[in-house]
Interface confidence: low
């Protein structure tokens, strides 16, 4: 292969000028002609100077994976996915989030120790003896009534197991 300059790409034993971001190569250069570049069509992009014959497909942000589009795709930049409200990122792939998960819900008998963020699940903590939380949404447990002992001892522990993948 020929040793091409940074703004060129190899074609056989020759070097042709690259197309700019947002364009792909429609026709390689010839002896008398430069590279023929064509704009990327909607739903495709190329972010850099390139010698590609086709533009790259924009990524879709799948709501079933808890994702929403945080930046729309343009012909020069791929879409970026973020987590839908109430979700946090559990699988990062390169520079984007590939899957989000809904925050854990604290069980009755637990308090919310730390609320969820885009990269971190809700952390639940069992209420101390003599206090209670009837629905698991409170940040502080309330001081007990006659049934607080039952609430503390019978409620199962929450599952705030975050996965890094």
């Amino acid at each position: 292969l020929p040793s091409c300059k940074e703004d060129e790409y190899p074609v056989g034993s020759e070097c042709c000028p690259k197309c700019g971001p947002g364009f792909h190569v429609r026709q390689a250069c010839g002896e008398q002609t430069g590279t023929v570049c064509e704009p990327c069509s909607p739903g495709t992009y190329i972010a850099h100077f390139n010698g590609l014959s086709k533009c790259l497909q924009c990524q879709m942000c799948d709501p079933a994976m808890g994702l929403r589009t945080s930046r729309n795709c343009s012909t020069t930049a791929n879409a970026l996915c973020g987590c839908s409200p109430g979700h946090f990122c559990i699988i990062q792939d390169g520079d984007h989030c590939a899957a989000c998960r809904a925050y854990a819900t604290s069980s009755p008998g637990q308090r919310v120790q730390k609320g969820g963020t885009e990269s971190q699940d809700t952390l639940c903590q069992n209420c101390p003896p003599g206090t209670f939380s009837s629905n698991g949404t409170l940040e502080e447990c309330q001081h007990g009534t006659k049934c607080s002992k039952w609430l503390v001892t019978e409620a199962g522990p929450g599952t705030s197991s975050f996965r890094w993948v």
């Epitope: 699988i91 990062q92 197991s161 996965r163 890094w164 993948v165």
Partner: antibody
Framework: QVQLQQSGAELVRPGTSVKISCKAS????????LGWIKQRPGHGLEWIGD????????KYNEKFKGKATLTIDTSASTAYMQLSRLTSEDSGVYFC??????WGQGTSVTVSS | DVVMTQTPLTLSVTIGQPASISCKSS???????????LNWLLQRPGQSPKRLIY???KLDSGVPDRFTGSGSGTDFTLKISRVEAEDLGVYYC?????????FGGGTKLEIK
């Protein structure tokens, strides 16, 4: 580009402790978990635990509770794992790994008298 | 803990030929959120592990499409359509559905 750089190999005596480090470059310390994994020939890979740099709390595999202590120094972008009361069973290669699938190069720990 | 059993232990394949690795879990890996947290890793000789596949079948960035992951419940498969020299190493399956995370024992892919 995130990179995880681990401290060098350790040769330590039984009954002592060792602390190994994992220094991150890039943004891993603000938005992802960091885990530690043990590898021993014939035993494959074992997950030890995770630490969350932003919140300073950990999750441990029950098997390693009391053996491994995970800490973090956010200002130095460095995570640490201390292994205590070492025996020959603790010999192996220890990896740190980030949620975005970045792995350190591994730190070999050899426990020998 | 969930036990992950990989077969075969060793796989000897000619370059250009296909390869298949099986991974079985002692419990279903289908999580309550409807996702199955099963990854495949490759550890090349003398290197750190590298994730190839996550969520059973999704390829990581930069992983060639000759790799495919499939399966559900307790039975999972990693297939390589045409083995290349750079594919040699030890392949691990890795579940994250149940606490604690657990790995398969590994399958060593050698080139004939």
């Amino acid at each position: 580009q995130v990179q995880l750089q681990q401290s060098g190999a350790e040769l330590v005596r039984p009954g002592t402790s060792v602390k190994i480090s994992c220094k991150a470059s890039g943004n891993i310390f603000t938005n992802s978990w960091l885990g530690w994994i043990k590898q021993r020939p014939g035993h494959g890979l074992e997950w030890i635990g995770d630490v969350y740099p932003g919140g300073g709390y950990n999750k441990y595999n029950e098997k390693f509770k009391g053996k491994a202590t995970l800490t973090i120094d956010t200002s130095a972008s460095t995570a640490y794992m201390q292994l205590s009361r070492l025996t020959s069973e603790d010999s192996g290669v220890y990896f740190c790994a980030g949620a975005m699938d970045y792995w350190g190069q591994g730190t070999s720990v050899t426990v020998s008298s | 803990d969930v036990v992950m059993t990989q077969t075969p232990l060793t796989l000897s394949v000619t370059i250009g030929q296909p390869a298949s690795i099986s991974c079985k879990s002692s419990q279903s890996l289908l999580d309550s959120d409807g996702k199955t947290y099963l990854n495949w890793l490759l550890q090349r000789p003398g290197q750190s592990p590298k994730r190839l596949i996550y969520l059973v079948s999704k390829l990581d960035s930069g992983v060639p499409d000759r790799f495919t992951g499939s399966g559900s419940g307790t039975d999972f498969t990693l297939k390589i359509s045409r083995v290349e020299a750079e594919d040699l190493g030890v392949y691990y399956c890795w579940q994250l559905t149940h606490f604690p995370q657990t790995f398969g024992g590994g399958t060593k892919l050698e080139i004939k």
